[in-house]
């Protein structure tokens, strides 16, 4: 058993049918010695008397808020949560497996640049009685500080007969050095509590591996005289690291017809302009990627040919 926060304790339970459970001793936080009784949640049933209460925690029915009283007065509370292990594996019931980029991916993180700021998000089908707490550091044995805000509900989606909730959190490395080679990964730890269930989720990554630039900005077309060709120009996104001579991007320019089946013409360039043939009813799209490290491409920025 360990303390999650004041008066909230997590019992680690290795569960299987007929498991003996964990013996837990609760102590009433009071100088009183006599006439103390214990109850669980809203029930008035007296579970025991005395300054300590010994319970065998076998299942979620044994978790909850234990209260010690004397003469009708509440003396103290202890909330017991369960962290359940089955077949040697800690439960992952609260969050949804996003299966990207691989199975058992519960947390996904992205950074728009090398400033040490990143966003992580996760999915759940649970709508109520849910709290998250996020901690992060660079490295784990001698951790360097990363500050995370509060997790917030960032999107709701309906998928079939299921409602899905997306939560996200923003974190910032306290002493980030954008140009430095990373040797220790960022560690992100999310504590999730649903009702009486505690779970924790972790992710470990280098900023360079989670980079996803914003789309190029100010995408413009300039028709070339006496030609079906156009000059496409764009700029680096505002959120990308500077100077651009050091933090360089490469770009992919795509001409896509109205029909998805039509052949796509693609041009790759390190410049911020390109000359392409603009077909009728087609659109031109540009996306960006770090020039020197193959992390994610940005989303597309698009303009119609007409």
């Amino acid at each position: 058993i360990w303390e999650l926060k004041k008066d909230v304790y997590v019992v680690e339970l290795d569960w299987y049918p007929d498991a003996p459970g964990e013996m837990v001793v609760l102590t009433c936080d009071t100088p009183e010695e006599d006439g103390i009784t214990w109850t669980l949640d809203q029930s008035s049933e007296v579970l025991g008397s005395g300054k300590t209460l010994t319970i065998q925690v076998k299942e979620f029915g044994d978790a909850g808020q234990y209260t010690c009283h004397k003469g009708g007065e509440v003396l103290s509370h202890s909330l017991l949560l369960l962290h359940k292990k089955e077949d040697g594996i800690w439960s992952t019931d609260i969050l949804k497996d996003q299966k990207e980029p691989k199975n058992k991916t519960f947390l996904r993180c992205e950074a728009k640049n090398y400033s040490g700021r990143f966003t992580c998000w996760w999915l759940t089908t649970i709508s109520t009685d849910l709290t998250f707490s996020v901690k992060s550091s660079r490295g784990s044995s001698d951790p360097q500080g990363v500050t995370c805000g509060a997790a917030t509900l960032s999107a709701e989606r309906v998928r079939g007969d299921n409602k899905e909730y997306e939560y996200s959190v923003e974190c910032q490395e306290d002493s980030a050095c954008p140009a430095a080679e990373e040797s220790l990964p960022i560690e992100v730890m999310v504590d999730a509590v649903h009702k009486l269930k505690y779970e924790n989720y972790t992710s470990s990554f280098f900023i360079r591996d989670i980079i996803k630039p914003d789309p190029p900005k100010n995408l413009q077309l300039k028709p070339l005289k006496n030609s079906r060709q156009v000059e496409v120009s764009w700029e680096y996104p505002d959120t990308w690291s500077t100077p651009h001579s050091y933090f360089s991007l490469t770009f992919c320019v795509q001409v896509q017809g109205k029909s998805k089946r039509e052949k796509k013409d693609r041009v790759f360039t390190d410049k911020t302009s390109a000359t392409v043939i603009c077909r009728k009813n087609a659109s031109i799209s540009v996306r960006a990627q770090d020039r020197y490290y193959s992390s994610s491409w940005s989303e597309w920025a698009s303009v119609p040919c007409s």
């Epitope: 809203q42 979620f60 029915g61 089955e86 019931d93 007969d161 649903h194």
Partner: nanobody, 123 residues
Framework: EVQLVESGGGLVQAGVSLRLSCAAS????????MGWFRQAPGREREFVAA????????YVSASVKGRFTISRDNAKNTMSLQMNNLKPEDTAVYVC????????????????WGQGTQVTVSS
Amino acid sequence: EVQLVESGGGLVQAGVSLRLSCAASGRAFSNFDMGWFRQAPGREREFVAAINRSGSSTYVSASVKGRFTISRDNAKNTMSLQMNNLKPEDTAVYVCATGLLFPSSAERNYDYWGQGTQVTVSS
């Protein structure tokens, strides 16, 4: 919202078998742990059995262990309770419930409840 409808109850002789079903609708069935409870006249509601969302783990009350088996079919949105070697003391209204805390024998940990199906076992 989740709607639960039990079926399969009836009047039977001691020693025979009965299979109860619980049909769920409303929200994704496979997101929920499920349980069976029973209530005999003049007695408190009693936990019978529970099953986790995938059906890989079950939790059965000591009073029915070895005689009752809980199972589920997520493709059909149904849960079943196979009751063998029934005894007169199994007479009760059997109610199914959904929750998100498996394993639990506590009513307070279940969120949605059916109306129940009557099982009467005569000697």
